[in-house]
Interface confidence: low
């Protein structure tokens, strides 16, 4: 704000990210043949006009005219924060103050607490922590594109007394759809200027198998070769497949991995077939009705858990 007093210098508050460069600009309308001076929060003179007063190579002269003194401070540290004073040695001495705020950059977050091989419907609890922010950063969670509601960010002062460590926890019940999902903790802070700073944890979920029977070809005829593929899914993937035909004993032999093969279809092959896929998480039986009299088999929609 330009005062009615033309010899009153003016400046502005500045915000800078730690490690960055800040320019301090001081202007005066009527210098009364006096030089402008910048001093730091410890009241050490930095520049008097174009003359360097403090041996600090980070501090450089940007502009020195009778009406302006601008200096730059590079590689700014948290300790540089405070009120910088621009003075003009008129009678009386007039001063203007610039509050330099140094933002501490939050470190990449760290996720802890993940327990491998969660079972479906169990609760996953993850913790996220980031140090070094000033002011205190905020943490957010997401699972893929879905936002997760973690607890309120907790704030703790770092040992340096200037920056903060923030932490947050999130808990959620896992489903089979979460197998292989990435849980992401992101740190939000004005020093990042919108840049993404996040850490992800891929989770594994163990769940019971499912299966479906797929005929090949899709529409077999009498006399053709037919394969009934039993396609099992689950985590872990089913390792054991057992075929049965309703009304027949004992279980049928597979001739190709999990598939049941009919080298030459005839009417006696008609009937309902079941495939039981088993993992150490459980079993699932899928059914398929084959009617060789018809031009094509008709799959049934029924399936049974065991």
């Amino acid at each position: 704000n330009l005062s009615q007093d033309d010899s009153q210098p003016w400046t502005s508050d500045e915000t800078v990210v730690a490690g960055g460069t800040v320019v301090l600009k001081c202007q005066v309308k009527d210098h009364e043949d006096s030089s402008l001076q910048w001093s730091n929060p410890a009241q050490q003179t930095l520049y008097f006009g174009e003359k360097r007063a403090l041996r600090d190579n980070r501090i450089q002269l940007v502009s020195s005219t009778p009406h302006e003194l601008s200096i730059s401070i590079s590689n700014v540290a948290l300790a540089d924060e405070g009120e910088y004073t621009c003075s003009i040695f008129t009678m009386p001495v007039r001063t203007a103050k610039s509050l330099v705020t140094v933002l501490g950059i939050p470190q990449k977050p760290i996720i802890t607490g993940y327990k491998s091989s969660l079972r479906e419907k169990e609760t996953a609890t993850l913790n996220c922590q980031s140090s070094g922010s000033k002011p205190a950063a905020q943490l957010t969670w997401r699972k893929g594109d879905q936002e997760l509601h973690g607890d309120q960010t907790r704030i703790q002062e770092d040992p340096n007394g200037k920056t903060f460590t923030v932490s947050s926890s999130v808990s959620f019940q896992v489903t089979r759809e979460d197998d292989g999902a990435n849980i992401v903790c992101s740190v939000n802070h004005e020093s990042l200027k919108g840049a993404d700073r996040s850490t992800s944890q891929r989770i594994e979920v163990l769940y019971t198998p499912t299966a479906m029977i797929r005929p090949e070809p899709a529409h077999p005829r009498e006399g053709q070769k037919l394969l009934l593929h039993c396609e099992g899914r689950g985590n872990p993937v089913p390792q054991q497949y057992v075929w049965v035909k309703e009304g027949s004993e004992p279980p049928l032999k597979m001739t190709q991995e999990s598939a049941l093969i009919f080298p030459f279809l005839n009417k006696s092959d008609s009937g309902t077939y079941g495939c039981t896929a088993t993992s150490n998480m459980g079993s699932y039986t899928a059914y398929f009705t084959l009617n060789v009299n018809d031009p094509s088999p008709v799959p049934s929609s029924s399936s049974t858990y065991h």
């Epitope: 508050d13 915000t15 509050l99 705020t101 002011p135 205190a136 704030i155 002062e157 903060f164 004005e190």
Partner: nanobody, 124 residues
């Protein structure tokens, strides 16, 4: 721009307690300091208490020390002043304020945004 809306004033007997609230909207509340000032009838505005953005640093006027507590809840964007052991000389219009810098300021000139004021009357 910051808007500050105050609540919680009223009439209280000497020795009683009151809690003032100040809800902020606009610019991110948590990044900036906040202060409480008061103005007694016929007097100038005087500093009561201030708190920095994290709540870790507070400062009190001598008249408020030991009786008043300033606090903030950044999740609710709200500043509080808990006033205990109230005296007749605490009667004043109380204002919450926000400066444009990220450090607490103890001088009214350092504040840019002000609440509407709330009257606290201490009388038997």
């Amino acid at each position: 721009q910051v808007q500050l809306v105050q609540s919680g004033g009223g009439l209280v007997q000497p020795g009683g307690s009151l809690r003032l609230s100040c809800a902020a909207s606009g610019r991110t509340f948590s990044n900036y300091a906040r202060g409480w000032f008061r103005q007694a009838p016929g007097k100038g505005r005087e500093f009561v208490a201030a708190i920095d953005y994290s709540g870790g640093s507070t400062n009190y006027a001598d008249s408020a020390k030991g009786r008043f507590t300033i606090s903030r809840d950044n999740s609710k964007n709200t500043l509080y002043l808990q006033m205990n052991s109230l005296r007749a000389e605490d009667t004043a219009v109380y204002y919450c304020a926000a400066p444009a810098s990220r450090r607490p300021s103890w001088d009214a000139d350092g504040y840019d945004y002000w609440g509407q004021g709330t009257l606290v009357t201490v009388s038997s």
